[in-house]
């Protein structure tokens, strides 16, 4: 088992990258002098206790920033949030911390990230640029749920 996070960069099919702005992740077109975030990801060590064939359950964080992506309900709506959290603290817990877990599925070069806590809800960006990352259950034209994940070695 790999027990250190892997690092990666993410962009969507419109070549927008993830940028941290006021503790919020937004997707913007790549430009010079821009600093896209580097993703830290690590597979859940309790994979056998999670659903099979849904993807690889992973914790997703921002490399070097002690921030992790999580899903929580605001009212009745699952929302995507950034929480101050060491990704290895999550990895080492005695049970999967589902609010911080995502099923990572790959099809060709495309990756999707489905919330483990809220099945059927995916990390997405609006088709319009400069918008925060969200969770959506509508896999259509309004939102992009397919991302390109490039691992950095």
């Amino acid at each position: 088992k790999i027990d250190t996070p892997q690092r990666g960069s993410i962009q969507d099919i419109n070549h927008r990258v993830w940028v941290l702005q006021d503790q919020t992740l937004i997707a913007v077109p790549r430009k010079d002098r821009m600093s896209p975030v580097t993703i830290a990801l690590i597979s859940c060590r309790h994979v056998e206790t999670l659903e099979k064939d849904r993807g690889n359950p992973i914790y997703l964080g921002l490399n070097g920033l002690n921030l992790c992506l999580m899903c929580a309900k605001v009212g009745d709506q699952p929302t995507l949030q950034l929480k101050e959290k060491d990704i290895m603290d999550l990895y080492n817990q005695p049970e999967p911390v589902k609010s911080f877990l995502f099923y990572h599925s790959q099809s060709g070069r495309n990756s999707t990230f489905e919330s483990v806590a809220f099945p059927g809800w995916f990390i997405a960006v609006s088709s319009e640029g400069g918008c925060p990352l969200i969770l959506t259950q509508e896999l259509g034209k309004a939102n992009t749920t397919d991302f390109g994940l490039t691992m950095l070695f």
Partner: antibody, heavy 121, light 109 residues
């Protein structure tokens, strides 16, 4: 408020099976893990196993693997422990407990009132 | 499989400080054992006190604190109250299962 309410006391003969229930209220059972623990007379606590009610996956102490079966009915927010091939040494109070993630860690925060299972010929 | 051992009984004076410990037969207890402490008062259900070695559960008074002490998990009650008279159990995590201790009966006298 959060509550775990267990079924009533049972008397069983050696070799029989028993099924104990634990009904949850005041929280969404799918957001936590439900564990079963037992306490024999004058003894400490003994962990039996747990279930993830959202998915149905289980873990068991190797000692109880094969004799204990934990299931859930999310429509009624109820978790069950079935214990088979009972012997006199299985006489104990059986407890369900919620293992809940809060802040930075998991806590065995809420427990059922216990179900006494007596195994006697 | 590890055996987890606690002091069978301890006594503390009201307002005094007492430390309960939790030892593992498999070696030193570490933060990777995610020590939990639960309390059972006479005639009441169990209630969680500590998780993750030193995190207090919501609503637990600050006089309860968890730590590691000499290779053991420890629960310290500072300024013990009469209502702290109870049985206390620790639980340690070992890779894929939990092991509970035999419990400590605490008398506040």
């Amino acid at each position: 408020q959060v509550q775990l309410v267990q079924s009533g006391a049972e008397v069983k003969k050696p070799g029989a099976s028993v099924k104990v229930s634990c009904k949850a209220s005041g929280f969404n059972i799918k957001d936590t893990y439900i564990h079963w623990v037992r306490q024999a007379p004058g003894q400490g606590l003994e962990w039996i196993g747990r279930i993830d009610p959202a998915i149905g996956t289980t873990r068991y102490d190797p000692k109880f693997q094969g004799r204990a079966t934990i299931t859930t009915d999310t429509s009624t927010s109820t978790v069950y422990l079935e214990f088979s091939s009972l012997r006199s040494e299985d006489t104990a109070v059986y407890y369900c407990a919620r293992l809940h993630y809060f802040g930075n860690n998991f806590f065995f925060d809420y427990w059922g009132q216990g179900t006494l299972v007596t195994v006697s010929s | 499989q590890a055996v987890v051992t606690q002091e069978p009984s301890l006594t503390v004076s009201p307002g005094g400080t007492v430390t309960l410990t939790c030892r593992s037969s498999s070696g030193a207890v570490t933060t990777s054992n995610y020590a939990n402490w639960v309390q059972q008062k006479p005639g009441q259900a169990f209630a969680g006190l500590i998780g993750g070695t030193n995190d207090r559960a919501p609503g637990v008074p600050a006089r309860f604190s968890g730590s590691l002490l000499g290779g053991k998990a420890a629960l310290t009650i500072s300024g013990a109250q009469p209502e702290d008279e109870a049985d206390y159990f620790c639980a340690l995590w070992f890779s894929n299962h939990w092991v509970f201790g035999g419990g400590t009966k605490l008398t506040v006298l």
